[in-house]
Structures are given as structure tokens and as C-alpha cells.
């Protein structure tokens, strides 16, 4: 049986960014249409996971599995579930949570980000990265790269393979 | 407010291990007490994903993340709200779906654990890395090794961090 | 077909080293799918296994507990040898030491002619 | 560490006779995963090293006369010589592989009586 995944083009290019991996964030922007100025955005911060390095990209990889593995993630499946008491009321969709992060982690400022991180893991080594990680996308990111990013996200969200 | 994780130190040393992260892997073991044969296993699977490069801990990163916020581990969130409608009977257990991913990759020939693989995540390219990483630890892991990395997983799964 | 080739002294002096070293031919000491061994027998303990080598990416030991805190096996992949050292012997170690290659790390199907090694007090 | 026990110690028996050796290890050596026993038996002649005869409980190694065989599951082991011959005196030893630290049996001598 193949098992219906939460929004599988997301993780793909989450983990494509977080990884440093260029020819792997190419070939699951092409799935989702990504315009030129969209691939840029996204290789922006491409590039401040690949500069602070491995522990980054663990740290970051951690923060991902443990919101998505989180009871708010959870929580939101349980909803449906209470509402009707059915299990195929579970969509694909992206966890709003998830959604939260990703947004703040792109508009927000430093200090919000971080905070929601710590909502879900609150050891200081994961914070100082994410503070950096955040920083660094606002030091190489022009307001257009960001709004080029959440345009992304909305493809990404509403795509077929979401 | 914290939220509750499904067993955060299983995805620490997870992602320790996956990244190829030693000292990482060296505090979340010294956490639950592991035995000097117990780190010894797990040293011998994280020399797989260092040896197999960035591209195997970006895929299994993936799988995991995928298999942890999968409609079969989020099923059983929903189960236990189903049975009395309340959210707070959802738990830190980790999901069965992850552990018996793990116990495969430990314990199951290359087919069963592939099989599993690619019931979550069927890209060609992540069930080729899937079987790779299970063949390496196969070729370095004994059978005592494999029964030390098991007796550490129970550790994790019953420890209070989980 | 396999054959392994034992040398070293047959005679060591209390609290110094023992130092074996075994030559393989017929098969490669990096091989990925077979462990070296080294073994010995007395009348007191038996045959009683010290520990191995074996490749897989890197090199990996294993080692008896008996003697953990004294032993080294190490392989040299230029000589497609590998040697024991087994350090502050006492007249206890006295004993015939075999050299054997295990088929990945199970039976040993392949063993040295063995070696005589006395400790001297 | 697993504790092979090995009887008798030593058995004389005439040519032609069928000589069985047992072993018994301290705990199971079936890997319920691939439902092996991880056990061989050696022969040892004097002046020589161990010859490998068994291996996985019951599989013969090449060009070991197949009148030898190697029986039993979990902890209890047997060694068989069905016609006993003059080549087969020897000390015989069991040995275990599952556990990392590899443990033999005290051996059993096997004479022409």
C-alpha cells in the first residue's frame, strides 16, 4: 500500500535547501514550476544552510521532524478525525504549524522565529542556530527575494503533489 | 507554551547519527545511558551515512520526516482522539510506523526494508539510498551489534525523554 | 586457496610485548567479507579467541575482554599482513597463538600453523 | 560471554562404530532474524591447528566426508561420525559465532578403542 503523505513536494524541497543540495532543490522546483526568480529566493537560503555549515542542517532537520511529528501536527489530523469521526478527512495539506514556521522564518523578525522554534525544541544550541540561520536569510534577502519565496510556498501548497 | 514532541531524543540521536555528527551522537547517548557496545553500534551506522555522503542523509532525513508526519503515524493520533474524543490522550510515544522502519533496517533482509521504504517515499532515487545504507549495515554491523543497537532503542523509546 | 603464515619469537620475557604477525596469501587482509583472527591454546584456558580485524570502508577490532586492555591487532594492507601485539605478558600467556580468518565475522575456515610462545619469569 | 559445554570429554569406540559428541551452549545461538544457529564444529589433530568440519550447526565444509555431520538447534548440539575411521581420532570442538567474542567448547578426544 502506498500511504498518502502531509504535502511530500514541500519536505522534498525543505530537505533540498537544508541539505545544500543544488542539482536535488533544481529537480523539485521544476515539479512545482518554479519561475527564475523563485530559484534564486530559494538559493539564497540554500546558501545560509551551506554556510553555517553541517550542525545547521541537522539542527534545522531536527526542528522540521519535530513540528511536523509535534501534537499541534497531530492536533490537526485529530480535529478532522473529532469532527466526523472518518480517517480519509485527513488531507495532505502542509501542518498549519509547519505553514507558521516557514512564514515567520521569512517575514517575521528574529526574535518571533526564534520563538516559535522554541515552542517545540528549546535547547539552546537548536535557537542560536535558528537565529543565525534566520539572520543570515535577512542579510542575503531582498524584500522581493522573500515575496518570490512565499510564492513558492503557495505553488508549492497548492500543487497536485502537496 | 512547550509543546509536547513524539519522543524528542529519538530524533536526536537520529539526526546525529543520519548527519554524521559524533559529538552530537556522544551527548544524546550519554542522555540515556547508552553502554560502551551500544555506542559502538550506532558508530557503525552513522560510518554508513558519512561513508554514503551528503545525498544519503539528505534522502533518509526525508524518509523519516516523511514516515513521521504520514498519515500512518498520524492514524495514530487519530485512533486514540476517536476512542474518547479527547486530544490529551495523544502521547510521546513514537510512531509505530518509525519504529518498525528501524527494527527492518536493523533486522529485515534488504527487500522487507526497501519494501517499507517505499510505501512512504517511492522515488527511485531514495529507495536506491535506502538500500545502500541497509546493505552497509549489514556488511558492518554483527548480529551482536545489531541486538546492542535494538537494546538502545528500547532505552530511547521508554527513557523520560521520550 | 587461502594459506596464512605465522612468525615471531617463541620466546618472551615477563611484563615485555608478544609480537606475532601473520601473512595471508590467496586472499587480501582489506577484503570486505572476511575478519582476521588471532587465537590461542593452553592446557589451562583451551582455545580461547583474542580478537580480530576486519575492512568495511575502515578498519573495525573487536576484543576479547580478557585482554582488552593489552592487545592490538593491527592489519598492514602494503604486506597483506596483520599482527598481534599483546603487551605486559605474564607466564599465563603462555601458549600456542593461531592466526585464522573468519568468513565475515562467523567460522574460521581458514587457520595459521600455529606458534609456541613461551613467557619466561 | 557464551559458555560452550562439551560431553563426554574423551570417548574410545571401535572402528566402524557411530560416535556422537555433544555441546551445550550457556544461551541460544539461533538469530531468530535469518533462523540460524551460529555454531561450528573443528577437528583438531596433534601437532596441527583446528580444521574447520561444520559450520551453521549442520552444513558440511568441502571435502569433509559426509559419514561427519552436525545436528541440533538453540543451546543443544551433536557432532556425528556415523563409521568411525582411523583418521577421525582427533580432539573435536564445538564453537559459537552470534556473540562478538568468539567462545569454543573444551574439546572431546575421540581414540580407537
Known amino acids: 500500500v502506498k500511504m498518502a503523505e502531509t504535502c511530500p513536494i514541500f519536505y522534498d524541497v525543505f530537505f533540498a535547501v537544508a541539505n545544500g543540495n543544488e542539482l536535488l532543490l533544481d529537480l523539485s522546483l521544476t515539479k512545482v514550476n518554479a519561475t527564475e526568480p523563485e530559484r534564486t529566493a530559494m538559493k539564497k537560503i540554500q546558501d545560509c544552510y551551506v554556510e553555517n555549515g553541517l550542525i545547521s542542517r541537522v539542527l534545522d532537520g531536527l526542528v522540521m521532524t519535530t513540528i511536523s511529528s509535534s501534537k499541534d501536527c497531530m492536533g490537526e489530523a485529530v480535529q478532522n478525525t473529532v469532527e466526523d469521526l472518518k480517517l480519509n478527512t485527513l488531507g495532505r495539506e502542509i501542518c498549519p504549524a509547519v505553514k507558521r514556521g516557514v512564514d515567520l522564518f521569512l517575514t517575521g523578525t528574529p526574535d518571533e522565529y526564534v520563538e516559535q522554534v522554541a515552542q517545540y525544541k528549546a535547547l539552546p544550541v537548536v535557537l542560536e542556530n535558528a537565529r543565525i540561520l534566520k539572520n543570515c536569510v535577512d542579510a542575503k534577502m531582498t524584500e522581493e527575494d522573500k515575496e518570490n519565496a512565499l510564492s513558492l510556498l503557495d505553488k508549492i501548497y497548492t500543487s497536485p503533489l502537496c | 507554551v512547550k509543546m509536547a514532541e513524539t519522543c524528542p531524543i529519538f530524533y536526536d540521536v537520529f539526526f546525529a547519527v543520519a548527519n554524521g555528527n559524533e559529538l552530537l551522537l556522544d551527548l544524546s547517548l550519554t542522555k540515556v545511558n547508552a553502554t560502551e557496545p551500544e555506542r559502538t553500534a550506532m558508530k557503525k551506522i552513522q560510518d554508513c551515512y558519512v561513508e554514503n555522503g551528503l545525498i544519503s542523509r539528505v534522502l533518509d532525513g526525508l524518509v523519516m520526516t516523511t514516515i513521521s508526519s504520514s498519515k500512518d503515524c498520524m492514524g495514530e493520533a487519530v485512533q486514540n482522539t476517536v476512542e474518547d474524543l479527547k486530544l490529551n490522550t495523544l502521547g510521546r510515544e513514537i510512531c509505530p510506523a518509525v519504529k518498525r522502519g528501524v527494527d527492518l533496517f536493523l533486522t529485515g533482509t534488504p527487500d522487507e526494508y526497501v519494501e517499507q521504504v517505499a510505501q512512504y517515499k517511492a522515488l527511485p532515487v531514495v529507495l536506491e539510498n535506502a538500500r545502500i545504507l541497509k546493505n552497509c549495515v549489514d556488511a558492518k554491523m554483527t548480529e551482536e551489534d545489531k541486538e546492542n543497537a535494538l537494546s538502545l532503542l528500547d532505552k530511547i523509546y521508554t527513557s523520560p525523554l521520550c | 586457496q587461502v594459506q596464512l603464515q605465522q612468525s615471531g619469537p617463541g620466546l618472551v620475557k615477563s611484563s615485555q610485548t608478544l609480537s606475532l604477525t601473520c601473512a595471508i596469501s590467496?586472499?587480501?587482509?582489506?577484503?570486505?567479507?572476511?575478519?582476521w583472527n588471532w587465537i590461542r591454546q593452553s592446557p589451562s584456558r583451551g582455545l580461547e579467541w583474542l580478537g580480530r580485524?576486519?575492512?568495511?570502508?575502515?578498519?573495525?577490532?573487536d576484543y576479547a575482554v580478557s585482554v582488552k586492555s593489552r592487545i592490538n591487532i593491527n592489519p598492514d594492507t602494503s604486506k597483506n599482513h596483520f599482527s598481534l601485539q599483546l603487551n605486559s605478558v605474564t607466564p599465563e600467556d603462555t601458549a600456542v597463538y593461531f592466526c585464522?580468518?573468519?568468513?565475515?565475522?562467523?567460522?574460521?575456515?581458514?587457520w595459521g600453523q600455529g606458534t609456541l610462545v613461551t613467557v619466561s619469569s | 560471554d557464551i559458555v560452550m559445554t562439551q560431553s563426554p570429554d574423551s570417548l574410545a569406540m571401535s572402528l566402524g562404530e557411530r560416535a556422537t559428541i555433544n555441546c551445550k551452549s550457556s544461551?541460544?545461538?539461533?538469530?531468530?532474524?535469518?533462523?540460524?544457529?551460529?555454531l561450528g564444529w573443528y577437528q583438531q589433530k596433534p601437532g596441527q591447528p583446528p580444521k574447520l568440519l561444520i559450520y551453521?550447526?549442520?552444513t558440511r565444509e568441502s571435502g569433509v566426508p559426509d559419514r561427519i555431520s552436525g545436528s541440533g538447534s538453540g543451546t543443544d548440539f551433536t557432532l556425528t561420525i556415523s563409521s568411525l575411521q582411523a583418521e577421525d581420532v582427533a580432539v573435536y570442538y564445538c564453537?559459537?559465532?552470534?556473540?562478538?567474542?568468539?567462545?569454543f567448547g573444551g574439546g572431546t578426544k575421540v581414540e580407537i578403542k
Open positions: 585464522a580468518r573468519a568468513w565475515n565475522w562467523y567460522y574460521l575456515d581458514y
Open positions: 590467496g586472499d587480501s587482509v582489506s577484503s570486505n567479507s572476511v575478519a
Open positions: 564453537q559459537q559465532y552470534l556473540r562478538n567474542t568468539l567462545t
Open positions: 544461551q541460544s545461538v539461533l538469530y531468530s532474524s535469518n533462523n540460524k544457529n551460529y
Open positions: 551453521w550447526a549442520s
Open positions: 580485524t576486519y575492512y568495511r570502508s575502515k578498519w573495525y577490532n
